[in-house]
């Protein structure tokens, strides 16, 4: 049914879906706090621009009776139920923030006539790519995939003189929501990653992974996995690892590696960690990043979603344009806005761009050091440490195929 949008006459509302099934187990109260802080900043910015309007949020909670797995497994129906709730109330904001689960976002996008923008903190899967009115504020799987292909092909760096064309992917089904979709994208036979690699095998059992570490007949020296150092240790323990094995540990939303007092454990020496660059405020204030690290990225994406809406609202109001139009719904892309922690850039498809950082463990200092950075916006790699103190022979990454290159 046609739902009227509470989005005119100087009063602009944001519909926030507070789903029990969420990409990250973040207390809903924290997300509410993030939204409310975002609203306050938006109000301040609009006042600063001389725009005397009201901006509020309506939090839509599901009853949690049926869809109570807590993770994303039962999110498809929960998302649609919340949309039904909005429809029954005949009340929709100018923008929908949430859901975060790929399943629910995909289904909601399919099942609704989207004449309003949808902003998601999550929705990592490839099935949520290229959606005209969907904006994603946490790095989606496509961005990871493009980095990996770029890095595999790179062969002109002092520490990487071989192109790679093979990989193992460890995926055992217990991953967090972000990791699940990242690995799912790498596994998919039709994905860009699969298309560009000559050999790729998914390891699904712990034993398969453990056997590969010393298997002389392995087809690749490179293993991609997703999670934190503790996850790797549980799997690998103190087992011996062949000297030309390279483990790529995807751990995007974890900034513990950048803390001053962090020492890399010994089992991380043949691991390259892929994470996101810690946000840097334009003001370069030492407090620009003082959100609690564990809460940071997910709640911050909600907050930035509010700021993004405020940014677009300001532009449309200043231009005297209507908010309840397809033009507004399609405008949340190909732009940079001022986020909570500094500028946030969205690509042509409304997906957040970021700087990914590849870290290695220095054999000298036992500290994590930046090997290179990768700008997802321009799909370009920038080497940082030209003479890394690697564990690998000659301080070069080995070839991906056993028996060739530095051993």
């Amino acid at each position: 049914s046609q739902v009227s949008q509470n989005c005119h006459n100087g009063s602009y509302e944001i519909s926030v879906l507070m789903m029990g099934n969420s990409a990250f187990a973040e207390p809903l109260k924290n997300l509410e706090d993030a939204v409310n802080e975002g609203l306050e900043i938006v109000r301040g910015r609009l006042q600063n621009a001389g725009l005397n309007v009201t901006v509020n949020a309506t939090f839509m909670y599901s009853d949690g009776l049926i869809h109570n797995s807590g993770d994303c497994r039962s999110s498809t129906c929960e998302g649609l139920d919340l949309l039904r709730k909005i429809s029954n109330a005949q009340r929709m904001g100018c923008v929908l923030i949430g859901p975060s689960c790929t399943y629910s976002t995909f289904q909601m996008y399919l099942d609704t006539e989207l004449s309003y923008p949808m902003i998601s903190a999550g929705s990592f899967g490839l099935s949520c790519d290229y959606k005209e009115t969907l904006t994603r504020l946490m790095s989606p799987a496509r961005k990871l995939m493009y980095f990996l292909v770029n890095f595999w092909k790179t062969n002109d760096l002092p520490f990487k003189t071989y192109s790679w064309s093979t990989s193992y992917v460890y995926k055992n089904g217990t991953e967090t929501e972000d990791c699940f979709w990242y690995l799912n994208a790498l596994e998919a036979s039709v994905s860009y990653f699969s298309h560009e690699l000559g050999f790729k095998v998914v390891l699904r059992q712990d034993k398969e992974f453990q056997d590969i570490l010393m298997d002389h007949n392995r087809k690749s020296n490179v293993i991609i996995m997703c999670g934190g150092p503790e996850f790797l240790y549980k799997l690998k323990g103190d087992r011996a690892v062949a000297e030309d094995i390279v483990i790529i540990l995807v751990d995007l939303f974890n900034d513990q590696y950048f803390e001053d007092n962090v020492t890399a454990p010994d089992y991380m020496k043949n691991v390259l960690v892929l994470t996101l660059s810690p946000g840097n405020s334009l003001l370069n204030s030492s407090f620009s990043r003082n959100l609690s690290p564990t809460k940071r990225d997910f709640a911050l994406a909600y907050l930035n979603g509010i700021l993004l809406f405020g940014h677009m609202l300001k532009i449309f109001l200043e231009n005297g344009e209507n908010i309840t139009t397809p033009k507004f719904a399609h405008a949340f892309r190909n732009l940079t806005f001022e986020g909570y922690d500094g500028p946030v850039t969205l690509d042509d498809w409304g997906d957040v761009d970021s700087t990914m950082v590849l870290l290695y463990t220095s054999v000298d200092t036992k500290k994590y050091k930046v090997l290179l950075t990768y700008d997802t916006h321009v799909n370009k790699t920038y080497p940082v440490d030209m003479s890394p103190t690697f564990t690998w022979k000659n301080s070069k990454l080995p070839n991906d195929i056993t028996g060739r290159g530095p051993q």
Epitope: I41, R43, N290, E338
Partner: antibody, heavy 121, light 106 residues
Framework: EVQLVESGGGLVKPGGSLKLSCAAS????????MHWVRQAPEKGLEWVAH????????YYADTVKGRFTISRDNVKNTLFLQMTSLRSEDTAMYYC??????????????WGQGTPLTVSS | QIVLTQSPALMSVSPGEKVTMTCSAS?????MYWYQQKPRSSPKPWIY???NLASGVPARFSGSGSGTSYSLTISSMEAEDAATYYC?????????FGSGTKLEIK
């Protein structure tokens, strides 16, 4: 460079009124919550009042509630503290400070140099 | 409101000595913040989120604690560390400061 410059302090008789100002520059003033904090001579810091970035949320210390009013002008990047029914115990150096109001970012990361208020007959 | 009690109120320490000052909260708080203030100067943020040093703060400083008990430690006292240190919480409204610990050099 972030700068907070307080002004408006001075000598006032008990029961009198005064308005303090804090001019902000070098940052997006409208993105930040702002506070007034005071320090009586040879004493510790005492938080006085807070106003959120969009002025929707305002808090006061019990000691000033009903007498002091915090406000801001996001166009002019200025914070104010209107003080009435002043008492001798309000004598202090008054600092403005900025913060955010979210999770761990609730730190007063920049402070002005302070403006002195003396309440005496 | 949450009351923060700092101890000791005054410390006189020789250069090179280890210094530990404490801040006790009347109710549990998630994080503690610390500020340094020198005479005739504004307070400076010193430690945030309990244990993170503000930019420019020497590595000899550290912060720790949880719940109702927090501390600031200087591993080896230097002359420039002489100042008053205030703890602060904003776990709940209103924000509150401790009464301060004055650190003098012997």
């Amino acid at each position: 460079e972030v700068q907070l410059v307080e002004s408006g302090g001075g000598l006032v008789k008990p029961g009198g009124s005064l308005k303090l100002s804090c001019a902000a520059s070098g940052f997006a003033f409208s993105d930040y919550g702002m506070h007034w904090v005071r320090q009586a001579p040879e004493k510790g810091l005492e938080w006085v009042a807070h106003i959120s970035s969009g002025s929707s949320t305002i808090y006061y210390a019990d000691t000033v509630k009903g007498r002091f009013t915090i406000s801001r002008d996001n166009v002019k990047n200025t914070l104010f503290l209107q003080m009435t029914s002043l008492r001798s115990e309000d004598t202090a150096m008054y600092y403005c400070a900025r913060s955010r109001n979210y999770y761990g970012s609730r730190v007063f990361d920049y402070w002005g140099q302070g403006t002195p208020l003396t309440v005496s007959s | 409101q949450i009351v923060l009690t700092q101890s000791p109120a005054l410390m006189s320490v020789s250069p090179g000595e280890k210094v530990t000052m404490t801040c006790s909260a009347s109710s549990s708080v998630n994080y503690m913040y610390w500020y340094q203030q020198k005479p005739r100067s504004s307070p400076k943020p010193w430690i945030y989120l309990t244990s993170n040093l503000a930019s420019g703060v020497p590595a000899r400083f550290s912060g720790s604690g949880s719940g109702t008990s927090y501390s600031l430690t200087i591993s080896s006292m230097e002359a420039e560390d002489a100042a008053t240190y205030y703890c602060q919480q904003w776990n709940s409204n209103p924000p509150t400061f401790g009464s301060g610990t004055k650190l003098e050099i012997k």
